[in-house]
Interface confidence: low
């Protein structure tokens, strides 16, 4: 079955960077876009961006442009999200989630378990 | 960015009774060729969001048929025909028509 397994929780200082990994299994990794979404305490879910593993094409939420980098390692079926210049408001649970076309419909279907990133001095 | 507004934000329900959640977008979510990328997710306590409905009204496989989606343009609704105890959690709508994709603020469904 489709599974997305993320790396463990991270505690970072303001100004530092964090890199979260997401390993996909149970499906053809290169056939589906990988999305990244975060959820800060008491906030709505927020879409960060997406990457096409087959060609490494990316689309980013402008809010994160310049601070976030999405990459993949196809050989390891793993996607990465790196967020730099961290600030306290980046404290959130970060999710990877698979997206794909089903016939003519598109949806983000399966989600990772989430990675808590805490930014604190 | 497209703003997604859900209502109500809190929904106390009685098991066996119907429930309805509304989601309104600040602009039309219909693509030029007719598709509308509007989906609904349920996030149960301590879990990741799970897909319920995609393309406005298509139930994701394994989702009970008590869940249904409807709407068009800017107004969308998720209905639960008979709420069960396992349905509690926070429900989110998501638009995937315009980038950046945006979520509603969530509707917390809890048993009365």
């Amino acid at each position: 079955q489709v599974q997305l397994v993320q790396s463990g929780a991270e505690v970072k200082k303001p100004g530092a960077s964090v890199k979260v990994s997401c390993k996909g299994s149970g499906y053809t990794f290169t056939s589906y876009w990988m999305h990244w979404v975060r959820q800060a305490p008491g906030q709505r879910l927020e879409w960060i961006g997406e990457i096409d593993p087959s060609e490494s094409n990316t689309n980013y939420n402008q809010k994160f442009k310049g601070r976030v980098t999405l990459t993949v390692d196809i050989s390891a079926s793993t996607a990465y999200m790196e967020l730099s210049s961290l600030r306290s408001e980046d404290t959130a649970v970060y999710y990877c989630a698979r997206g794909g076309y089903d016939g003519w419909d598109y949806a983000i279907d399966y989600w990772g378990q989430g990675t808590l990133v805490t930014v604190s001095s | 960015d497209v703003v997604m507004t859900q209502s109500p934000l809190s929904l106390p329900v009685t098991p066996g009774e119907p429930a309805s959640i509304s989601c309104r977008s600040s602009q039309s979510l219909a693509k030029s060729y007719g598709n509308t990328y509007l989906s609904w997710y349920l996030q149960k306590p301590g879990q990741s969001p799970q897909l319920l409905i995609y393309g406005i009204s298509n139930r994701f496989s394994g989702v009970p048929d008590r869940f249904s989606g409807s709407g068009s343009g800017t107004d969308f609704t998720l209905k639960i025909s008979r709420v069960e105890a396992e349905d509690v959690g926070v429900y989110y709508c998501l638009q995937g028509t315009h980038q950046p994709y945006t979520f509603g603020q969530g509707t917390k469904v809890e048993i009365k």
Epitope: G100, Y101, D102, G103, W104 | R59, F60, S61
Partner: antibody, heavy 121, light 107 residues
Framework: EVKLVESGGGLVQPGGSLKLSCAAS????????MAWVRQAPRKGPEWVGF????????YYADTVTGRFTISRENAKNTLYLEMSSLRSEDTAMYYC??????????????WGQGTSVTVSS | DVQITQSPSYLAASPGETITINCRAS??????LAWYQEKPGKTNKLLIY???TLQSGIPSRFSGSGSGTDFTLTISSLEPEDFAMYYC?????????FGSGTKLEMK
Amino acid sequence: EVKLVESGGGLVQPGGSLKLSCAASGFTFSDYGMAWVRQAPRKGPEWVGFISNLAYSIYYADTVTGRFTISRENAKNTLYLEMSSLRSEDTAMYYCAREDGTTGESAMDYWGQGTSVTVSS
Amino acid sequence: DVQITQSPSYLAASPGETITINCRASKSISKYLAWYQEKPGKTNKLLIYSGSTLQSGIPSRFSGSGSGTDFTLTISSLEPEDFAMYYCQQHYEYPYTFGSGTKLEMK
């Protein structure tokens, strides 16, 4: 070239179970919806059910609803039909077929050679 | 369910002739009707979909027409390899349903 090869058919008693497989090759399996169609001796074909490319949507004929389960493993390029509570009227040749939905006008464009299922005591 | 009535159930013709097979749906299915050819020992072959669209690789002597409830498959200048079983199928809504078949035999 597109190839669909069914397997798993055989003789089973009424009330018994059987799992059919369909191995696909020659195309990107995860891009296509797949269907099962059966044909009883001296009868026309009967559509059994359909599973969309990412398995978001699964549909069944009324005659098999609750007894048959369609699934797919895109990572293995394989389609399945799990049949339980089998009846004599389920005796048929079972075909898997690719549904070409790329035009938005779906038709079953490639079929397998079929696998025979006989339900008899 | 949409009922599909196919006629005739049997047809004898000679190579070079033109034949037609008809299918009628119990309600409007727009243009969404497909035609298949079935031969012993071979996999079913899609000939026509969406009423009149020729599947790639299918000879142009095969043509489809019709919309709504009434559809026709025409094979002009029959070739020896065209003698086979033909089925129509609606792909307008689930459950997909088939006609009962037309057996085309050589005179």
